[in-house]
Amino acid sequence: MKVLQEPTCVSDYMSISTCEWKMNGPTNCSTELRLLYQLVFLLSEAHTCIPENNGGAGCVCHLLMDDVVSADNYTLDLWAGQQLLWKGSFKPSEHVKPRAPGNLTVHTNVSDTLLLTWSNPYPPDNYLYNHLTYAVNIWSENDPADFRIYNVTYLEPSLRIAASTLKSGISYRARVRAWAQCYNTTWSEWSPSTKWHNSYREPFEQ
C-alpha cells in the first residue's frame, strides 16, 4: 500500500482542516488508514482522524482544531496499521479556505432597490471576521447569458443594486462567497443560492 498523491490540507481558520490524498489503488480509507496530527506546541496532545473515502483511491479527513492562530504548525503522520506511509507538516494559516457565508437574503421592498444581505461565517473574535471581502453572483434562471459578479470590497456583508439593472418580470438567483486578502486565502465555497422574482415600475416616458 502506497500513497500516490500526498495529503494536501486546507483550513477554515476556525475549527476544521480538511486533508485529501490518493492511494495507489482502491482503499477502504476508514478501516485501513489513520491520520495522526499534533500541534507543535507545549503540552499538545496527538489526535487521530479516521478518513473517509473520496472516490475509489481517494481519501479525505476532517481534522478538528482548537484556537487556530497564525503561529500554529501541525505534524501529520499517515498510518496503515503499523506502517508509516507518509510524514509531513501543515501550517493552517498558510492554506486557508474561508467558510462560506450564510443566510443570504434578498430584500425587495426597498423602493426599486434590491438589498442583498448575508452573514459573516466567523465570530467577532476570529481574525478573519474583520478581513473578509465577498463576491456576489446573480444570474437569471431564464437566460444563461444574464450572469454577473459584484465584488464587495467593504466589510459590511450587504450589497445594494438598482432593480432596474436587472430585467423585470423574471426570476433571478443569487449566491455569495468570501475570501481574505490578509492570508492570501482561496475563495470559499458558494453559499446556498436564494431566488426572487424581479419586478419594478418602469419610469413613464414623456
Epitope: 506546541f41 507545549l42 503540552l43 496532545e45 482548537d66 484556537d67 492562530v69 497564525s70 503561529a71 473574535d125
Partner: antibody
C-alpha cells in the same frame, strides 16, 4: 462574552501555601490554554506557567519549578494555581489569562499578600 | 530579570504620535511573534497587538505594531488622555524550555 473570574484576595504567612482559582465562562473551556502570570507591587509582569485544560498537563517557568502547581476542574470550568513555601517576595497580584502564544483575555487578578 | 527591554517611560501631548520599542534577541523576538498589552492604572492587562501587527476586535487602528529583526515597536497615533497606561511587550521562547517572557514595561504619560 469571555469571562475569567478569579478568587478573592488572600493574606498568608511565610512558608504557607495559597491556591488561587479562575473560573472561565463564555467559551469552550477545554479548547484554550490558560496561562498564569503575576505582578509584584510597582513591578512588571512575570510569567509563571501554562496549563492545557483538555488533558490537564501543565508546564512552569523554571523560577517556580517545584513550588507551583496548576490544575483544572472541567466540570466547573475552573483552573487553579497553587504556590507553596510562600515568602514576602511572592506578594503580588496573580492573573490567569486565556491564550496560547499570547494572552487574549485576562482575569481581574487576585492579590496575595505574604506577611508575618 | 526580563530578556525583553523597553524604555521605562515615554511621553507626548494629546494628538501626537508615540512609539515604544521592545528589544530582544534571536532566541525570542527574532524567532517568534510579538504581542503588546496595555495596563491601565489599577486594572488587568489587555491584549492590544498580537502576531507582531494584528489588532484584536475592538482595538482602534491608532494602535499598530511592527517587528524588524530582534526589535518590535508599538506605535500609538492621535494620543488620547485615556491612553495613559503601562505597556508591555511579550513573546515566547522555545529553545530548551518553553517560556513566555514579558518586556520590562513602559509608562506612557500623555502631557
Amino acid at each position: 462574552q469571555v469571562q475569567l473570574v478569579q478568587s478573592g484576595a488572600e493574606v498568608k504567612k511565610p512558608g504557607a501555601s495559597v491556591k488561587v482559582s479562575c473560573k472561565a465562562s463564555g467559551y469552550a473551556f477545554t479548547s484554550y490554554y490558560m496561562h498564569w502570570a503575576r505582578q509584584a507591587p510597582g513591578q512588571g509582569l512575570e510569567w509563571m506557567g501554562i496549563i492545557n485544560p483538555r488533558g490537564g498537563s501543565a508546564s512552569y517557568a523554571q523560577k517556580f519549578q517545584g513550588r507551583v502547581s496548576m490544575t483544572r476542574d472541567t466540570s466547573t470550568s475552573t483552573v487553579y494555581m497553587e504556590l507553596s513555601s510562600l515568602r514576602s517576595e511572592d506578594t503580588a497580584v496573580y492573573y490567569c489569562a486565556r491564550g496560547k502564544y499570547w494572552m487574549y483575555d485576562w482575569g481581574k487578578g487576585t492579590l496575595v499578600t505574604v506577611s508575618s | 530579570q526580563s530578556v525583553l527591554t523597553q524604555p521605562p517611560s515615554v511621553s507626548a501631548a494629546p494628538g501626537q504620535k508615540v512609539t515604544i520599542s521592545c528589544s530582544g534577541g534571536s532566541s525570542n523576538i527574532g524567532n517568534s511573534y510579538v504581542s503588546w498589552y496595555q495596563q491601565l492604572p489599577g486594572t488587568a492587562p489587555k491584549l492590544l497587538i498580537y502576531d507582531n501587527n494584528k489588532r484584536p476586535s475592538g482595538i482602534p487602528d491608532r494602535f499598530s505594531g511592527s517587528k524588524s529583526g530582534t526589535t518590535a515597536t508599538l506605535a500609538i497615533t492621535g494620543l488620547q488622555t485615556g491612553d495613559e497606561a503601562d505597556y508591555y511587550c511579550g513573546t515566547w521562547v522555545t529553545s530548551t524550555v518553553w517560556e513566555w517572557p514579558f518586556g520590562t514595561g513602559t509608562k506612557l504619560t500623555v502631557l
